[in-house]
Interface confidence: medium
């Protein structure tokens, strides 16, 4: 069976029907490049006006305008708000009332696209394997990133969150139109990784999505993550404005000027430094969501009532922090280089600024306790990775799980740890699952490109797709079309239950209280330490391209400051960054 032309609010769309075997039978209808909204530079998205005739939805559209990996050029385009749909079809009748899974990509709110990285037309976020194996509809889409998606003056002149509003428009479009593709508009699951996972979290917290989202999955990211909310948007807006020659004293004039500036210039006016800096790399992420008093009306911690009826799976990779550790402490990955106490203390200090010296000391002490018994470089490097993993991913996720559970009415809560080790041959032997390592398994790459994977990788992929799509179907990862290797029990506040996802999942894979000692430290010991006030006022970046980056703006509400970017850094960004 195949859909043919489908009528949507914008007009007719026609995709392609791809047979899953030479013998016919099962197939998948694929629609690429359906417009779901339009947007002017630094303006909220609007509904797409539609089209005449039948739109041939057969090719992915270009990504939203963003800097290239080398950050010296741009690619993509401003006209980018398009979505893609995969609809699994059986032999005889077209599908009806299928669960819908809407994917939100990561990329530090700075890069990425709905189709994901591409190698010889093999796109990372190809929804085919999830759709056909789980019998669900998969939707991916583009949203604005970088300055064009998240630049904000912190007031009504440029409220920011344009990229989040794009995401909302896509979800709302799916709600309104997916029935025509055979989807159940009352059973939408949003899922995402890293910045996409934090976006998923923010979408569930936003009052704008009330009634749109039934379930959610956050993979390595939360609204509570320290890198997910910008507390000093005006500082960064002024930084960009100065670079492109716009006035900075009056936010109205600044906004008006920025809106008529070449979007490529705006995009290239910001560079993420990827060489080792004074502060951890995540604190240089300037253009990210803000608390705008509207789309995100309050601090995310105060919005969990909005998730009371949204089922949630949240988890992390066991070495999610590795990618960031390799930037912050480069010796972590270099067998011939050593990590020193000073390296780690500097890293700890950079992540504990709000609690001052006492915070840095207490944190350093608890994380280095094992060093006395095992002073090996391997142990020290693993500590660096564990610390980054905890601060950036584990602790925010655990707090979010507890908040979700505490506010739940009908909603169910599930937690996981992805521990299948990275397949990167250059990584140390002790390496676990790095940031973004889970993506290939969720998207079924071991099946789509079998020659590049082992049987154990297919086992992991099969299990993840089964749990994810069962959850989308029923709200319970154990119940649905797909058999699962073991029962995944819900998260409870008492036991902190989580599923440890490895190549062999058994009943022993259900575990409790992940890194409880460290969770207690952050939630209790660290939390009660007095917050220190920064001495400096908000400083502006240097006028020249010197190596010296100014101190970050002082902001007592931040867990860590966000230092300005340094124009002199032209280093290539890690191609694997999924954040």
């Amino acid at each position: 069976a195949k859909l043919g032309a489908v009528y949507t609010e914008g007009g007719f769309v026609e995709g392609v029907n791809k047979k899953l075997s030479l013998l016919g039978g099962d197939s998948v209808d694929i629609f690429k490049g359906i417009p779901f909204a339009t947007a002017k530079t630094l303006e909220n998205p609007q509904r797409h006006p539609g089209w005449q005739g039948t739109l041939k939805a057969t090719n992915f559209k270009k990504r939203c305008l963003q800097a290239t990996i080398t950050q010296d050029n741009t690619y993509g385009q401003e006209d980018c708000l398009y979505l893609n749909i995969w609809v699994p079809q059986g032999r005889k009748q077209v599908s009806h009332n299928l669960p819908v899974m809407v994917w939100i990509y990561g990329g530090a709110f700075l890069m990425g696209s709905g189709q994901g990285a591409n190698f010889l037309k093999n796109y990372l976020y190809d929804g085919e394997e999830i759709a056909t194996r789980g019998n669900v509809i998969v939707v991916t889409f583009n949203y604005r990133v970088g300055p064009l998606g998240f630049l904000s003056t912190g007031d009504a002149n440029l409220p920011g969150n344009f990229g989040l509003r794009d995401q909302h428009m896509a979800i709302a479009w799916v709600k309104r139109n997916i029935a025509a593709f055979g989807g159940d508009p009352d059973n939408i699951t949003i899922f995402g990784e890293s910045a996409g996972a934090a976006s998923v979290s923010l979408q569930t917290l936003s009052p704008y999505n009330k009634g749109l989202i039934r379930r959610a999955i956050s993979q390595s990211g939360m609204a509570l993550s320290p890198w997910a909310i910008q507390k000093n948007p005006l500082f960064w807006a002024k930084t960009i404005a100065k670079k492109v020659g716009c006035p900075t004293e009056d936010t109205g004039k600044m906004a008006a000027c920025l809106k008529i500036t070449d979007p490529r210039a705006l995009t290239l006016a910001y560079k993420l430094p990827v060489k080792k800096q004074e502060y951890p790399v995540v604190h240089y992420l300037a253009f990210i969501p803000v608390i705008d008093g509207d789309f995100i009306p309050d601090d995310p911690i105060n919005l969990y009532n909005n998730t009371a009826d949204i089922d949630y799976i949240a988890g992390i990779n066991n070495m999610d922090g590795h990618l960031f550790a390799t930037i912050d402490v480069p010796a972590v990955d270099k067998t011939k280089q050593t990590v020193t106490e000073e390296d780690f203390y500097r890293l700890v200090s950079g992540h504990t600024v709000a609690k001052g010296l006492k915070g840095a000391q207490a944190t350093f002490d608890i994380y280095t306790e094992s060093w006395a018994q095992d002073p090996s470089q391997e142990n020290m490097k693993k500590t660096v990775v564990a610390f980054e993993t905890d601060v950036l991913f584990l602790i925010p996720t655990e707090i979010a799980l507890a908040q979700h559970k505490a506010h739940a009415k009908s909603a169910k809560t599930y937690s996981y740890l992805f521990s299948h080790p990275s397949r990167m041959p250059i990584y140390p032997k002790w390496m676990g699952a790095d940031h973004a390592d889970d993506l290939q398994y969720v998207f079924g790459k071991p099946f789509a490109t079998p020659l590049g994977y082992r049987p154990q990788d297919r086992a992991v992929s099969k299990a993840m797709i089964a749990y994810w799509t069962n959850f989308a179907r029923s709200g319970d990862p154990n119940m649905g079309n797909s058999p699962v290797p073991t029962h995944w029990y819900p998260y409870t506040l008492e036991n902190g239950n989580y599923l440890d996802i490895t190549k062999t999942i058994t009943s022993a894979s259900m575990k409790e209280h992940l890194r409880e000692k460290f969770l207690k430290f952050w939630a209790v010991t660290f939390e009660v330490l007095p917050t220190v006030t920064g001495d400096q006022d908000t400083l502006t970046p240097p006028e020249d391209d010197s190596e010296v980056a100014p101190d970050p703006p002082s902001d007592d509400s931040q867990v860590v400051p966000v230092p300005p970017t340094d124009d002199s850094v032209e280093a290539q960004m890690p191609a694997t960054i999924g954040f």
């Epitope: 106490e341 010296l357 006492k358 840095a360 000391q361 207490a362 280095t368």
Partner: antibody, heavy 119, light 105 residues
């Protein structure tokens, strides 16, 4: 590299006060506590107190409370230790010492300042 | 206050000897630090957190122990090791042992 340079030797009369300085360089001054330790001639080491250069917070050993004051000047990356109501038994070499990392040991020491209390 | 008692207070040994200095804490502590001091010089950190060596400290120095009893061991004495050694506990009010003077026999 980390350097702690202390002020020169002092000779004081009983009942007077002395103020010893310790200028830090080679690291972020506000990121590490600074301690003061003294050593009387031929004797062992005695901890006097500590200051957090970031916010100026101090903690003094019980024995010296009321007599010792530790301050800092972030503009010059200098800490000071003032000891009042001096007596002959305060004759000692006074050291400033910076934390190693975290709340661990005293990893970097000044060269010491000899304070002689004599009438 | 936590009391730190070192033994012996002085010790004579020869180059190449294996030497052990002990430190007893009352009440028990988690970690201990050791310092070396030569005449007319500031103390130098030798071992921290009971057993960790700062960079630059030779591997002939080692530390062990827990609770109340801790030891500093020099596996093979070198001429430059003759000095006074102090143990120290780190709490809200740190205290040092009275010192052990290691002399040439």
């Amino acid at each position: 590299q980390v350097q702690l340079v202390q002020s020169g030797a002092e000779v004081k009369k009983p009942g007077a006060s002395v103020k010893v300085s310790c200028k830090a360089s080679g690291y972020t001054f506000t990121s590490y506590n600074m301690h003061w330790v003294r050593q009387a001639p031929g004797q062992g080491l005695e901890w006097m107190g500590v200051i957090n250069p970031g916010d100026g917070a101090t903690s003094y050993a019980q024995k010296f409370k009321g007599r010792v004051t530790m301050t800092r000047d972030t503009s010059t990356s200098t800490v000071y230790m003032e000891l009042s109501s001096l007596r002959s038994e305060d004759t000692a070499v006074y050291y400033c010492a910076r934390d190693y990392y975290g709340s661990s040991p005293l990893g970097y020491w000044g060269q010491g300042t000899l304070v002689t209390v004599s009438s | 206050d936590i009391q730190m008692t070192q033994s012996p207070s002085s010790l004579s040994a020869s180059v190449g000897d294996r030497v052990t200095i002990t430190c007893r804490a009352s009440p028990s502590i988690s970690y201990l630090n050791w310092y070396q001091q030569k005449p007319g010089k500031a103390p130098k950190l030798l071992i921290y957190a009971t057993s960790r060596l700062p960079s630059g400290v030779p591997s002939r120095f080692s530390g062990s122990g827990s609770g109340t009893d801790f030891t500093l061991t020099i596996s093979s004495l070198q001429p430059e090791d003759f000095a006074t050694y102090y143990c120290q506990q780190r709490s809200s009010s740190p205290t040092f042992g009275q010192g052990t003077k290691l002399e040439i026999k």
